[in-house]
């Protein structure tokens, strides 16, 4: 065509796949009458008529564009819907009068690829490979045009490097005309790359500008020989008996060698292999002081049969031995003194505490508890706690019962019990003393005795309420070798006029007696022996 070399560059129209391209015929009125225009698509320099405009009315020509073209803007613009990659070509409009002129439009089509999918080489890479090995593959699907790929290691872009880095990219065209890009990164890796993060980046263009998408970061298994093995103990810090302790072998090679853990026999000085779990971990649960000792780990490379030995590690399981208290079962008179001595062994410095068992009160900080001018109330439990202050939770205790000789001491002397005739009454009577008293009742019934502690006894009596019983009342008598003591239970009939018993009485029906009153400890400092009996 004469003068074609002087044709201006076509107007560029950019559009995304699936959207509508607006092809505006740029002929001026002088160049042609827009009410009489032919539209052509140009593919491989071949023109194909695709649309006619006559008297401002448009008509599609049969063919691939038949259903997708329409006229807009009073005939000046041709709209192409559902744009595909195959639509990337030149479109031209040709005016017929006054003379034949044409206007060219270059349609550029774009489609963002999907998120890049990265797959690491699952087999891993040995560090001593002679040539670059496949590290990972990056796939970017359904993009248009073909996106560019950039590989990164630890955030830095990788460039082709002879015998070290090679990037091999290929693409396939889908039936949709979209491209799928596949890029394989090959590299020679070193031991330090075991933690390296690799990812790929797809660079592509849209009508709005340049864009990029990044894959997730991956690490590749890197195989390298073991140079060193060592032991690791968990938990870190001071260990104590009862802890769960894990001893594991570690190596700086990948894959790790076959491990075995040995402990030195203190008698023979020989290393004896310990039994580990399926993960090669020696679990000491609960740890005991006997677990203390020298441990070492052997790593055997099953390929090369090279064996490596760790530095030995001393394990100390801190302990507190059984606590011994002397005297073990002290019996003392009122007014006498008692020295309780606590002993224990430990792998660390021990702290001793004496506590009153009943109250938890700390009486002494130290192994020796001295009790002077003992009163009956001093009888009971004393607990020695041997603890290691530097290791929280490491302690052992021993309870010792101090018996103070004395006749029976009644929990109450007198009590009123409200009853109904012919009911079965459950009465209780409590006494303490040393030797421990026995309790007898002055009425027939089913009695049972329960030892509350070494100095205290509780007797329970089930008895039928009869007129005779109401008259006589009930007495319980506690006795030991040092004396006798009696508690009296007055039985009173409940009747309609009995509303609230006076505040000094204890009410009760079928299970009548409330728990016995407790006697407050004497704080008297009078210089005399205690009362001969306590009547509750």
């Amino acid at each position: 065509v004469p003068g074609e070399a002087e044709q201006p560059a076509p107007e560029l129209v950019e559009v995304e796949v699936g959207s509508t391209a607006l092809l505006k015929c740029g002929l001026s009125q002088s160049q042609g009458n827009l009410s009489h225009v032919d539209w052509f698509s140009v593919h491989k320099e071949k023109r194909t008529l695709i649309f006619r405009v006559r008297q401002g009315q448009g008509q599609s020509e049969p063919g691939e564009y038949e259903q997708r073209l329409s006229l807009q803007d009073r005939g000046a613009t041709l709209a192409l819907t559902q744009v595909t990659p195959q639509d990337e070509r030149i479109f031209l409009c040709q005016g017929k009068r006054p003379r034949s002129q044409e206007y060219r439009i270059q349609l550029r089509v774009y489609k963002a690829p999907e998120e890049p999918n990265i797959q690491v080489n699952p087999l891993g890479i040995p560090v001593n490979s002679k040539e670059p090995e496949e590290v990972a593959t990056c796939v970017g699907r359904n993009g248009y045009p073909i996106p560019q790929v950039i590989w990164y290691k630890n955030g830095r872009p990788l460039k082709e490097e002879k015998n070290r880095v090679h990037i091999q990219s290929s693409q396939t065209v889908e039936s949709s005309g979209l491209y799928t890009l596949q890029s394989i990164l090959k590299a020679q890796l070193v031991k330090e790359d075991k933690d390296a993060q690799f990812y790929c980046e797809l660079n592509y263009r849209l009508p709005s500008g340049n864009h990029m998408k990044e894959s997730r970061e991956v690490t590749v298994p890197v195989f390298y020989p073991t140079e060193k093995v060592w032991l690791e103990v968990e938990p870190v810090g001071m260990l104590k008996e009862g802890d769960r302790v894990e001893i594991r072998c570690l190596a700086d090679g990948n894959p790790p060698p076959h491990f075995s853990i040995s402990k030195q026999n203190p008698s023979t000085r020989e290393a004896e292999e310990e039994t580990t779990n399926d993960n090669g971990v020696l679990v000491l649960e609960p740890a005991r002081k006997e677990h203390s000792g020298r441990y070492e780990c052997q790593g055997l490379d099953l390929d090369t049969m090279i064996s490596l030995l760790s530095e030995p590690q001393e394990l100390l399981v801190n302990y507190v031995s059984d606590v011994r208290v002397s005297p073990a079962a002290p019996e003392r008179q009122e007014g006498s003194s008692l020295t309780l001595t606590c002993e224990a062994e430990s792998s660390q410095d021990l702290e001793f505490q004496w506590l009153r068992e009943e109250t938890g009160q700390v009486l002494e900080r130290g192994p020796v508890l001295q009790l002077h001018d003992l009163k009956r109330e001093a009888g009971g439990g004393y607990r020695c706690v041997a603890s290691v202050p530097s290791i929280p939770g490491l302690n052992r205790t021993q309870l010792v019962n101090v018996a103070i000789f004395g006749p029976p001491w009644m929990a109450f002397k007198e009590r009123k019990v409200w009853v109904k005739e012919n009911m079965v009454l459950n009465l209780s009577c409590e006494a303490s003393g040393h030797p421990r008293p026995t309790i007898s009742w002055n009425v027939n019934g089913t009695a049972s005795e329960q030892d509350q502690d070494p100095q205290r006894v509780l007797s329970t009596l089930n008895v039928l309420v009869t007129p005779e019983l109401l008259e006589t009342g009930v007495e319980c008598t506690a006795s030991n070798d040092l004396g006798k003591n009696t508690s009296i239970l007055f039985l009173e009939l409940v009747n309609l006029t009995t509303l609230t018993p006076d505040s000094n009485t204890t009410t009760g029906l079928s299970t009548s007696t409330a728990s016995p009153h407790t006697r407050a400890n004497s704080t008297s400092t009078e210089r005399k022996l205690p009362e001969p009996e306590s009547r509750g």
């Epitope: 003392r332 008179q333 009122e334 007014g335 006498s336 003194s337 008692l338 002077h372 001018d373 003992l374 000789f405 004395g406 006749p407 006795s479 030991n480 070798d481 040092l482 004396g483 006798k484 003591n485 210089r527 005399k528 022996l529 205690p530 009362e531 001969p532 009996e533």
Partner: antibody, heavy 119, light 109 residues
Framework: QVQLVESGGSLVQPGGSLRLSCEAS????????MSWVRQAPGKGLEWVSI????????SYADSVKGRFTISRDSSKNMLYLQMNSLRAEDTAVYYC????????????WGQGTLVTVSS | FMLTQDPAVSVALGQTVRITCQGD??????ASWYQQKPGQSPVLVIY???NRPSGIPDRFSGSSSGNTASLTITGAQAEDEADYYC?????????????FGTGTKLTVL
């Protein structure tokens, strides 16, 4: 074995003073209350005084209260009875006795020492 | 307070004899019993409910009822001839006092 040996008995004038001693051996002295018991010639036994194992508590029969003082030295395993303002009716053999429980009984007795109050 | 004993009791050799002791304190405390032979120190023979110190023959036994304590010798022997004293804590005072019984002279015939 348990042994109690009294000493210090003698003839003393009325109104005079005397100190009796009792040496204990064969047991943990500080763990036991100790008593003095006396027996006038041809008469029965009469309890005189008691002291607790620690020495912190004492008690006396009405007949000697205010005149006699009981004490002990556990470091020396010794029991003492300081007798002041002695009277003729204090004449007796004085025994020291160990109290088994602090509540009775007297399970070991010394051989006794004679105190005579006479002008 | 007082613990009262019979001044004298006699028993035929091999027979059983009971020596009694009465007093209010015996409602709360058991009596202890002591044997004293002429020129000797007293010896504990029974204490508590019915306990014998080692070395005391089992013919000696004790019992208690109400305000009365008893020492029983079953099959009395000649060597049992002695003075016998009961002893108890005083339950009337607010601090410990001990009291001895008046004593019983046992003669074995």
């Amino acid at each position: 074995q348990v042994q109690l040996v009294e000493s210090g008995g003698s003839l003393v004038q009325p109104g005079g003073s005397l100190r009796l001693s009792c040496e204990a051996s064969g047991f943990t002295f500080s763990s036991y209350a100790m008593s003095w018991v006396r027996q006038a010639p041809g008469k029965g036994l009469e309890w005189v005084s008691i002291i607790s194992g620690s020495g912190g508590s004492t008690s006396y029969a009405d007949s000697v209260k205010g005149r006699f003082t009981i004490s002990r030295d556990s470091s020396k395993n010794m029991l003492y009875l300081q007798m002041n303002s002695l009277r003729a009716e204090d004449t007796a053999v004085y025994y020291c006795a160990r109290d088994k429980y602090g509540y009775n009984p007297f399970d070991y007795w010394g051989q006794g020492t004679l105190v005579t109050v006479s002008s | 307070f007082m613990l009262t004993q019979d001044p004298a009791v006699s028993v035929a050799l091999g027979q059983t004899v009971r020596i009694t002791c009465q007093g209010d304190s015996l409602r709360s405390y058991y009596a202890s019993w002591y044997q004293q032979k002429p020129g000797q120190s007293p010896v504990l023979v029974i204490y508590g409910k019915n306990n014998r110190p080692s070395g005391i023959p089992d013919r000696f036994s004790g019992s208690s009822s109400g305000n009365t304590a008893s020492l029983t010798i079953t099959g009395a022997q000649a060597e049992d001839e002695a003075d016998y004293y009961c002893n108890s804590r005083d339950s009337s005072g607010n601090h410990p006092l001990y009291v001895f019984g008046t004593g019983t002279k046992l003669t074995v015939l």
